[in-house]
């Protein structure tokens, strides 16, 4: 580019940047500064389309700079400018005030409660290592290989054992600090702990002393036994376990005071450690007396096993329990150790899984509950601890006794299986705020049905409707039972049904809700202000 051209360009820029220097009296009223090849001033182009237009243009030639400044300084225009400026700032301040008011008056985000790890999902009990792993495998090293499976269930904790040395009914030959060599070594246990931690699975150790004997607590030498438990708590906490379980506490004399002492040791080590107590009792008063002096104790009992499998009775049991326990964290199971199938017919397993995962508290399952493991279907297997059915080869005793749909392998491949339902529910339970710590409101839905809402603040809400009966039912959802904060919408989206055949994700009209026999529905709907 030549030097001349550069100068030309600068002139163009000056002319564009200082328009007041352009003459405003060009005939067309539109003078243009053009950079030509020569530096010969301005090129004026007169565009006259007709005589009338030219005449009009000649009448008004615009104001000169001096005239413009003179008019702009007149009192009228000054007042107008000030008024507009004032209007602008008032508008701006008004919007600011409006925003502040909206923010202040908008409902506060509810403060999240303190969440312990056992609040965030299910616990999985493996009371019998050998039965869980199957033929010839039952040890800690073998269990380590099953941790991926537990991860796939999205359970938060593994309740293991007891695995300590226990000679039946012999206090002196029971050592809570030693692992029974049949199960492995302390090194195997440490290795299991490390692997479990990497997979975010907590390990809870069962320290029920006389687990091979007639009376879990020996019913003797309670001072010696209690000291052994106390020493074991301290030892295993140092070893890195996340909590403890003791069962059959209805048979431990002065259980409340011992539990309080053991709880102090556990919580004294870390607030993040858990103590679970198990009882065979189903009596609410007995259960409450055990809970009374023990904050943060998780108690598993046979309370719900008395439900008689009717909607009304189950609703009554659940609401009584929640009312009686107030704001303490609950756990939900049908017993302290046994499988769901020892209490429930096969057709109610899905319904109970849905209920246990959606009630407020920690659901606790035994190994095999996720596949509907049933000792009665396996000849010669003990009711308390039947062999886990990993695949069809898991029970070779009677060829053909186990079909693919009874096994982990078979059910993993079937999206409509009990195992698939368990995994989906476990996933929802661990990530949805309303299910994690939401409020609970049960309400009437008609005879035979149990229905409730789980909601937390402005998060997505969940409606659960359970038909315990063996006939189809229409749900008459009585929203009048509900507080204003938990009102029902006209429609809710179907997240899942325990029965096949419904289109998931489709909106269902709540006034026209019909449930199949033994069907449970999990519906979701958004918060509406």
């Amino acid at each position: 580019m030549s030097q001349d051209t550069e100068v030309d360009m600068k002139e163009v820029e000056l002319n564009e940047l200082e328009p007041e220097k352009q003459p405003m009296n060009a005939a067309s009223g539109a003078a243009m500064s053009l950079a030509g090849a020569e530096k010969n001033g301005l090129v004026k182009i007169k565009v006259a389309e007709d005589e009338a237009e030219a005449a009009a243009a000649a009448k008004f030639t615009g104001l000169s700079k001096e005239e413009l400044l003179k008019v702009a300084g007149s009192p009228g225009w000054v007042r107008t400018r000030w008024a507009l400026l004032l209007l602008f700032w008032l508008g701006w301040l008004g919007m600011l005030a409006g925003a502040v008011v909206i923010i202040v008056r908008a409902p506060r985000c509810r403060e999240l409660p303190a969440q312990k790890w056992w609040h965030t999902g299910a616990l999985y009990r493996i009371g019998d290592l050998q039965a869980f792993q199957g033929h010839g495998a039952g040890n800690l090293a073998g269990l380590k290989g099953r941790l991926d499976y537990l991860s796939s269930l999205k359970v938060k904790g593994l309740v293991l054992g007891p695995i300590h040395k226990n000679q039946k009914d012999d206090v002196a030959q029971t050592d809570l600090l030693q692992i029974d060599p049949n199960f492995g070594s302390k090194e195997d246990f440490d290795s299991l702990l490390q692997s479990a931690k990497k997979k975010s699975i907590r390990v809870i150790l069962d320290l029920t002393p006389n687990y091979r004997g007639e009376n879990s607590w020996f019913s003797t030498q309670v001072d010696t036994v209690a000291t052994k438990v106390k020493d074991a708590l301290e030892f295993w906490l140092q070893a890195g376990v996340d909590g403890f379980q003791v069962r059959d506490i209805e048979n431990l004399k002065d259980a409340s005071s011992f539990l309080a002492e053991w709880q102090n040791i556990t919580k004294g080590f870390s607030e993040d450690r858990l103590l679970i107590a198990g009882t065979n009792s189903s009596d609410l008063q007995q259960i409450l007396s055990l809970l009374e002096s023990n904050k943060d104790l998780l108690l598993t009992s046979s309370y719900l096993s008395d439900s008689g499998s009717t909607g009304e009775h189950t609703k009554s049991l659940v609401t009584q329990y929640l009312n009686a326990t107030g704001n303490r964290w609950c756990s939900w199971s049908l017993s302290q150790a046994r499988l769901l199938t020892s209490f429930l017919p096969a057709q109610l397993l899905r319904l109970y899984q849905l209920m246990l995962f959606t009630l407020p508290g920690t659901p606790v399952f035994s190994y095999g509950d996720e596949i509907g493991l049933d000792a009665a279907a396996l000849p010669g297997q003990p009711m308390e601890a039947p062999v886990m059915l990993w695949d069809e080869s898991s029970f070779p005793d009677i060829p053909g006794a186990v079909s693919a749909n009874m096994t982990v392998k078979g059910q993993s491949e079937d999206p409509g299986s009990l195992l698939s339902l368990f995994r989906r529910l476990s996933d929802q339970r661990s990530k949805e705020r309303s299910l994690l710590h939401g409020d609970f409101h049960a309400f009437s839905a008609g005879p035979g049905l149990f229905s409730y809402i789980r909601h937390w603040d402005q998060n997505e809400r969940f409606l659960v409707v359970l038909n315990f009966g063996d006939v189809g039912l229409s749900a008459g959802l009585q929203a009048s039972d509900l507080p204003a904060s938990a009102s029902l919408p006209a429609k809710a989206d179907l997240l899942l049904s325990t029965q096949p055949g419904r289109e998931e994700g489709s909106p269902l009209e709540l006034e026209r809700l019909k449930l199949e026999p033994h069907e449970g529905l999990l519906l979701r709907f958004p918060y509406a202000a």
Partner: antibody, heavy 117, light 107 residues
Amino acid sequence: EVKLEESGGGLVQPGGSMILSCVASGFTFSNSWMNWVRQSPEKGLEWVAEIRLRSNNYATHYAESVKGRFTISRDDSKSTVYLQMNNLRAEDTGIYYCSRGDPGAYWGQGTLVTVSA
Amino acid sequence: DIQMTQSSSYLSVSLGNRVTITCKASDHIKNWLAWFQQKPGNAPRLLISGATILETGVPSRFSGSGSGKDYTLSITSLQTEDVATYYCQQYWSTPYTFGGGTKLEIK
């Protein structure tokens, strides 16, 4: 070998006081609940009092008939359990045994307390 | 308070015969029951605790059974050295209570 040895018994007038001691050996005293049990021809064997461990805040329990009059205590450093008896009555007469554990797996030979004018 | 009742104050049994002594609690004691043997001039000796657990050094002819409120001490074949008074005791809840005792004699 586990040994329990009671002492302090004797004759005392009604309304009087007496303190019984029981020295233990052969086991970890501080980890054991300790009891006092008495025996008389009229009442047979009768449990009197129990004291638990330091970790139980040395919790104590008493038979209704001695509540407010008798006090059980322990000194773990001396492996000794005591029974302080006040306002004694004729019906408190008997052989007083100390026993270890729950139930009494080990007993002393007993010390005779006679309450008489 | 839980009352303990031993139905027989005296039992007279021939040597070598089976002996059964019963004890009934007024309330459930969850197997927290002990059996003691006392010979004249001696302190009581613990035979069985936890309703069924035989103490070390106690002959195997002694056995305990029962649950809930009803408990039994059995001697399969009575020996001369078994002549004594037998007491049951509940230690489930304070105040701990003893039965009135059963005096065993040779017929």
